[in-house]
């Protein structure tokens, strides 16, 4: 038999400090987690302790926090070569600076192969791309080989920015003649390395014919065997077990997310290459673990510039951007306007003729929404004044509804109005209405929703059925603030993009903002 | 070295029941699935079914539905396949083999057990 | 389920003769095939799997070809050891099936 540790890690998104418990900023340094350099202890130790090791990242390296803001994934390229990745899958998110932004900074730099089988490249940009990202590689350890084949959520086009010159395939389809080739080669151990969720990787390891193991990413799940070393609760034990359709079991892996935990799987074959055996457990990356000095050191190098960007001008407002408690837990506030606005912009993808936009809808709670922005600083908008309006480190996310759901939702927003309570939601691509004077549970008497499927927007009423994309905070979209709705009704959830770095990108879009309180949010007394 | 051996003849009369045992060593038991095979006198080969001994999983063909049981004690390495309501056309050889999951090939075989139906 | 269907069920040939049988499946099975041989009174044994590769310890005038849904078995320069009964069997899709069997006689 033979032995192959695989240490993973996916959905990093931009964590190489170390974070709080939470993934936020560090404050306690003797109570933090991750970070490349204690990630690179770690990886060190077991590749000293153990023959056959692999390194490999299931994608969404790429956004997060202001090292990805200011670099543009040239730290990534840096560090992730620094600690030896054998391989890395794309995410959705290795699209958000589009196709340049990819190539430039990540494929072009990385030392280690980039993988997706199901992303095919045409026209011009076929040949630009070629060999800069590959559907597999054969990668030797030891004294075998082993295939690693990559995949990429088919959802890409309507979360990220991969241009209209990548094709995003169906993965299954797209995987099997690329492993059936591996398979030619004489390859008998093959890896699916990818970022298209767990029930996506559950299919592959069900589906895909001759891939002995999935390692995962896309959907943060955490699997752990045993009692769990931290706050997160296991989706199911580490590995996950799943039966192929002609009867393998599969190991499935995934890591979390954040660079708090480092996959550690180990897998015994036989030299026909089945799995005869598998087991590990994702490792806590906390503070028993030191941080590498050397790499700490290249941490702190690269820190500098950071710190020069937080107070460089972003764009300017013309108007106050009133982020205060007092407004936006009680009513429209145009500093939940401004951020709703930019949060629709940064989800503008025209994929389909039939609509002007996939998403139309926002919504925000306002206690997410922790500070004003005064004009009176020659307007001046920086990074340091958007920490201070979202300093949770959260993303905007997109999630499918039912309109129900969102009904629900709204009735939640002001069911224990005048308390100044987080869930009073602010609003983008609706108009709601409503009557105080009603108990709690029936307040809302008009919900008007814009159209996506439409070639001039408009508001029309929203149907109880029908299915709607709407972009939100990640804290709501996990039932913060009481939405336990939400979290418990969703269809369908995907992490978006740093929150600061949604609404730092629009205003230096705009230059200029003057956001106004416009009638999204309505109250009214009587019949309607 | 791997092998797999079987428990000896059995003679049964119609509408009894057989219970065949397949004893493995050489390997990690856990990690193959066991094939059960038959073949009646001057016939071919006859796939069954098989068990997965690491979670009991087990895999039947239609025709025997129903009829057959296959079990594995890890503890001993043994994995058993009993047949109930004989008829006198069960009567055949029966073979365990392990199978290899990359190809689906059944690489290690028992010496097979004859088992006749008659009343 | 997959239909397995040799040919010949039988046939004659003298040691040194190239023999070829053949196997066709009911529905495209890749290259999924495997092919055992069996002496009378014994277990089968692995020869071949996946269309062409040897098992260990076999012969190398054993090789196998094709793919889809037609496949061959061809023994190079027959033996006195190689008169036996030759089945194919598919590992596409459960559950697993056998060919009827090639009955290789001596001439």
């Known amino acids: 038999a033979w032995e192959l540790t695989i240490l993973h890690t996916n959905d990093v998104h931009s964590r190489l400090e170390q974070t709080s418990e939470d993934s936020s900023k560090c404050v306690n340094a003797s109570r933090c987690m991750g970070g490349v350099a204690r990630l690179f202890t770690k990886v060190q130790q077991i590749r000293r302790a153990e023959p056959n090791v692999l390194l490999l990242d299931a994608g969404d390296q790429y956004q997060g926090t202001i090292w990805f803001t200011v670099y543009k994934g040239a730290e990534v390229a840096h560090f992730m070569n620094a600690l030896r990745y054998d391989a890395m899958a794309l995410g959705n998110h290795e699209f958000d600076n589009g196709v340049e932004g990819l190539i430039e900074p990540l494929l072009k730099e990385a030392k280690f192969p980039i993988l997706s089988a199901n992303i095919k490249a045409k026209g011009p940009l076929a040949s630009q791309i070629s060999g800069l990202y590959l559907p597999y590689k054969v990668l030797p350890v030891g004294d075998e080989v082993v295939g690693i084949v990559g995949y990429t959520s088919k959802e890409t086009p309507f979360l990220s920015n991969p241009g209209t010159n990548l094709v995003f395939e169906d993965e299954i389809t797209a995987l099997q003649p690329e492993v059936d080739k591996l398979k030619t080669l004489n390859v008998n151990k093959i890896i699916a390395l990818g970022h298209s969720g767990f029930e996506m990787d559950k299919l592959i390891a069900q589906k895909v014919r001759g891939v002995d193991v999935v390692v995962g990413g896309h959907s943060n799940t955490f699997l752990y065997t045993g009692n769990p070393p931290s706050k997160e609760v296991p989706a199911g034990k580490y590995p996950f077990i799943v039966t192929s359709d002609d009867g393998r079991k599969v190991p499935v892996v995934q890591a979390y997310a954040f660079g708090k935990y480092l996959g550690y799987l180990k897998i015994e074959f036989d030299e026909r290459g089945n799995v005869i055996s598998s087991h590990g457990n994702p490792i806590l990356l906390n503070s028993s673990i030191p941080e590498d000095p050397s790499i700490k050191a290249d941490i702190n190098k690269w820190r500098i510039k950071l710190d020069n960007y937080s107070t460089q001008e972003l764009g300017k407002t013309i108007v106050y951007l009133d982020g205060s408690s007092q407004s936006c837990r009680f009513r429209e506030c145009n500093m939940g306007n401004l951020i709703c606005d930019a949060m629709i912009n940064n989800n503008l993808r025209h994929t389909d003729e039939m609509f002007w936009n996939h998403v139309s809808m926002c919504i925000l709670n306002g206690g997410g929404i922790r500070s004003p922005i005064d004009e009176r600083n020659n307007g001046t908008i920086t990074w340091e004044n958007l920490a201070a309006v979202l300093p949770f480190g959260g993303t905007f996310d997109l999630v499918q509804l039912k309109g129900s759901t969102l009904k629900k939702a709204f009735e939640h927003s002001v069911h224990r109005y005048g308390q100044s309570t987080g869930e009073f939601l602010q609003v983008g691509g609706i108009h709601v209405v409503y009557d105080l004077s009603r108990k709690p549970g029936d307040r809302v008497v008009k919900l008007d929703v814009l159209c996506t499927k439409c070639r001039v927007p408009s508001y029309d009423p929203l149907k109880m059925d029908e299915v709607y994309k709407v972009i939100l905070p990640n804290f709501l979209a996990n039932g913060g603030d009481g939405f336990q709705m939400i979290k418990d009704e969703l269809l369908r959830h995907d992490s978006g993009d740093q929150d600061i770095n949604v609404v730092s990108t629009y205003i230096s879009k705009m230059k200029v903002i003057y956001p106004a309180v416009e009638g999204r949010i309505k109250f009214s007394t009587g019949s309607h | 070295q791997v092998q797999l051996v079987q428990s000896g003849a059995e003679v049964k009369k119609p509408g009894a029941s057989v219970k065949v045992s397949c004893k493995a060593s050489?390997?990690?038991?856990?990690?193959?699935?066991i094939q059960w095979v038959r073949q009646a006198p001057g016939q071919g080969l006859e796939w069954m079914g098989a068990?997965?001994?690491?979670?009991?999983?087990?895999r039947y063909t239609q025709k025997f539905q129903g009829r057959v049981t296959m079990t594995a004690d890890t503890s001993i390495s043994t994995a058993y396949m009993e047949l109930s309501r004989l008829r006198s056309d069960d009567t055949a050889v029966y073979y365990c083999a392990r199978g290899n999951w990359d190809d689906w090939d059944f690489d290690v075989w028992g010496q097979g057990t004859t088992v006749t139906v008659s009343s | 389920d997959i239909q397995m269907t040799q040919s010949p069920s039988s046939l004659s040939a003298s040691v040194g003769d190239r023999v070829t049988i053949t196997c066709r499946a009911s529905?495209?099975?890749?290259?999924?095939l495997n092919w055992y041989q069996q002496k009378p009174g014994k277990a089968p044994k692995l020869l071949i799997h996946y269309t062409s590769r040897l098992h260990s310890g076999v012969p190398s005038r054993f090789s196998g070809s094709g793919s889809g849904t037609d496949f061959t078995l061809t023994i190079s320069s027959l033996q006195p050891e190689d008169f036996a009964t030759y089945y194919c069997?598919?590992?596409?899709?459960?559950?697993?099936?056998f060919g009827q069997g090639t009955k290789v006689e001596i001439k």
């Open positions: 069997q598919q590992g596409d899709t459960l559950p697993w099936t």
């Open positions: 529905q495209d099975i890749s290259n999924y």
């Open positions: 068990i997965y001994p690491g979670d009991e999983d087990t």
């Open positions: 050489g390997y990690t038991f856990t990690g193959y699935w």
